[in-house]
């Protein structure tokens, strides 16, 4: 299809090579189709055009994007070419930073239903650069915490170095929704609830004597508890002997529950008692069996392949700790009678 | 309980403070608490709200920006300062506080009466 | 700001009837939504929050729904007590929870 007729909108993201970080496009269709097609509930019953431009439908996921190639081959669809850039309703996720990702993206509804519609693109201008040294050495994290129960702010990384005096206006989205009245370069959090947590981005206009551009960058928030002030406690084995059958194959499991944590480096191992000596047993991984807010239970068994007699004579023992210490738990083998 | 009191007669273009004193909690819990107005006859217009909590956050309402100010006196006492009034400003003023749990105003005060007039 | 339209402006209905009044937010606000009944010289009362929570000692009579940015409250086996008009809230302002704009009110007549 012609794309000479999209509207056209330039972006900037200037990525960090220190961190990890997302960057999205929105299919930003033109007012009023985009409020009918993207984000229809932002028209008010007033606001509704006289003839709507997309009557093709209202599914949030029905539009298509495609990448220009520079060397002006046909579009490519970016679902068959891009496996780091995924899209999601009408948004569009860029897994990994790079240069590579700079080009020109096009979205459309992908049902063309009015002769309105033909017409009815975006063009995206995306420049991606990293970092330089030069830039704010104290930025913002794209990834940001918020302590649930307690004050936050949630800060936008391109201008966290900027005095809220002189940052221009920006533009903040939650979860691909306009926060509408949020204009500033911080967003502060009376209290912290749950619902807090998202993908939260922010844009700010940058002009030079040519043409101006959007400058946008993502934040993932994410809602915390306060660190836990408790060792790792051990919830299985609870009895400190196990009766067993000798040459039959056993495992033993052991479960610990670990309170939150912002650093979390959790242990848990076997490791063997016998008289004097001590070592530390191969084991498969540990694995994650719940996870909450608040803490999570890790599990670790010790497989033996057939019980012998001098297990008998020997102690299991299950280590676990965290930052705050250390807990373990003991178990003697004792042979079934009977 | 809350209880508005400061209401009158005012002038046109005149000032006036209005105050919102709670019985029986204190702001210690960290409300939200607010102002909402409804002119004789009419509807019920949000006016502002402050966080009684550390951040202190305030918000009005569009046509309130510049004129009215909302603070926190004390832990008890919040205020509603109002400036270059005009007739389209009378109207009873509600003191409410949000509810933390059922979010909406599950506390109001019983009002009191604005008059702009000469 | 966002702007709630409240319709009808005006409802009658017969003892034991129902009626239905609707709510339209101009942008989303999710399940942000409160309900209240205000009756002469009184101040309003919290009946629906979250668009479909009955506050604590409200009838079950009243139920709240919604759909995207329209919300409905509906009050069924009317009683003369329901005569009152009837507020939509918006009750999240950016990221905060904080009770904001109005919709513009029903009067719920009981005949």
């Known amino acids: 299809f012609n794309i000479s007729g999209c509207s056209t909108k330039k972006l900037l993201w200037t990525y960090s090579t220190r961190s990890e970080e997302e960057f999205v496009l929105f299919c930003d269709l033109p007012e009023p189709q985009k409020s009918h097609f993207c984000h229809r509930n932002r028209l008010s019953p007033k606001q509704v055009p006289e003839h709507l431009p997309f009557m093709g439908s209202n599914d949030l996921s029905d539009v298509q994007w495609y990448q220009q190639p520079s060397n002006g081959d046909p579009l490519e669809d970016i679902r068959k070419s891009y496996p780091h850039i995924i899209q999601d309703k009408c948004t569009l996720h860029f897994l990994t930073p790079g240069v590579n990702n700079s080009g020109s993206y096009i979205c459309r509804p992908k049902m063309i239903k009015s002769p309105y519609d033909v017409a009815c693109c975006v063009k995206m201008i995306l420049e991606v650069k990293p970092q330089t040294n030069a830039s704010c050495e104290y930025s913002a994290s794209h990834k940001q915490d918020l302590l649930l129960g307690s004050t936050g702010s949630i800060s936008c990384p391109s201008l966290s170095c900027q005095s809220d005096a002189q940052s221009p206006a920006v533009t903040w989205y939650k979860n691909g929704k306009l926060l509408s009245v949020e204009r500033s370069n911080r967003i502060v959090v009376d209290e912290v609830y749950d619902y807090h947590q998202g993908t939260y981005v922010c844009d700010y206009t940058q002009s030079d004597t040519v043409s101006s551009w959007t400058v946008r960058a993502v934040v993932q928030v994410r809602t915390i508890v306060g660190d836990t002030k408790l060792k790792p406690d051990i919830l299985d084995p609870v009895e400190d002997t196990l009766e067993v059958e000798l040459g039959k194959p056993l495992t033993i499991s052991c479960k610990a529950r670990f309170g939150f944590e912002r650093v979390f480096n959790p242990v848990i191992k076997w490791y063997i008692k016998d008289s004097d000596l001590e070592w530390e047993v191969s084991v498969p991984e540990a694995k994650s069996i719940k996870s909450t807010l608040k803490d999570e239970i890790i599990e670790r068994n010790i497989i033996l392949e057939k019980v012998t007699q001098r297990d008998l004579r020997r102690k299991f023992v299950c280590f676990v700790q965290n930052s705050i210490g250390n807990t373990t738990q003991s178990v003697q083998l004792k042979e079934k009678r009977g | 309980s809350l209880e508005e009191s400061g209401g009158g007669l005012v002038q046109p273009e005149g000032s006036l403070t209005l105050a919102c004193t709670a019985s029986?909690?204190?702001?210690?819990?960290?409300?939200?608490m607010c102002w909402v107005r409804q002119a004789p006859g009419k509807g019920l217009e949000w006016v502002a709200c402050?966080?009684?909590?550390?951040?202190?956050?305030t918000y009005y309402a569009n046509w309130a920006k510049g004129r009215f100010t909302i603070s926190k006196l004390s832990s008890t006492t919040v205020t509603l300062q109002m400036t270059s009034l005009t007739a389209a400003d009378t109207a009873t003023y509600f003191c409410a506080r949000d509810d933390k749990v059922e979010h909406g105003y599950g506390l109001w005060g019983p009002g009191t009466l604005v008059t702009v007039s000469s | 700001d966002v702007v709630m339209t409240q319709t009808p402006a005006s409802v009658s209905a017969a003892v034991g009837g129902t009626v239905t009044i609707n709510c339209q937010a101009s942008e989303s606000i999710d399940n942000w939504l409160a309900w209240y009944q205000q009756k002469p010289g009184q101040p309003p009362k919290l009946l629906i929050y979250s668009a479909s929570n009955l506050a604590s000692g409200v009838s079950s009579r009243f139920e709240g729904s919604t759909s995207g940015t329209q919300f409905t409250l509906t009050i069924s086996d009317l009683e003369c007590a329901d005569a009152a008009t009837y507020y939509c809230?918006?009750?999240?302002?950016?990221?905060?929870?904080?009770?904001?704009?109005f919709g513009g009110g029903t009067e719920v007549v009981v005949k």
């Open positions: 029986g909690f204190s702001f210690n819990n960290n409300y939200y």
């Open positions: 809230q918006s009750t999240f302002y950016g990221v905060n929870p904080v009770p904001n704009a």
């Open positions: 402050i966080y009684t909590g550390s951040t202190g956050s």
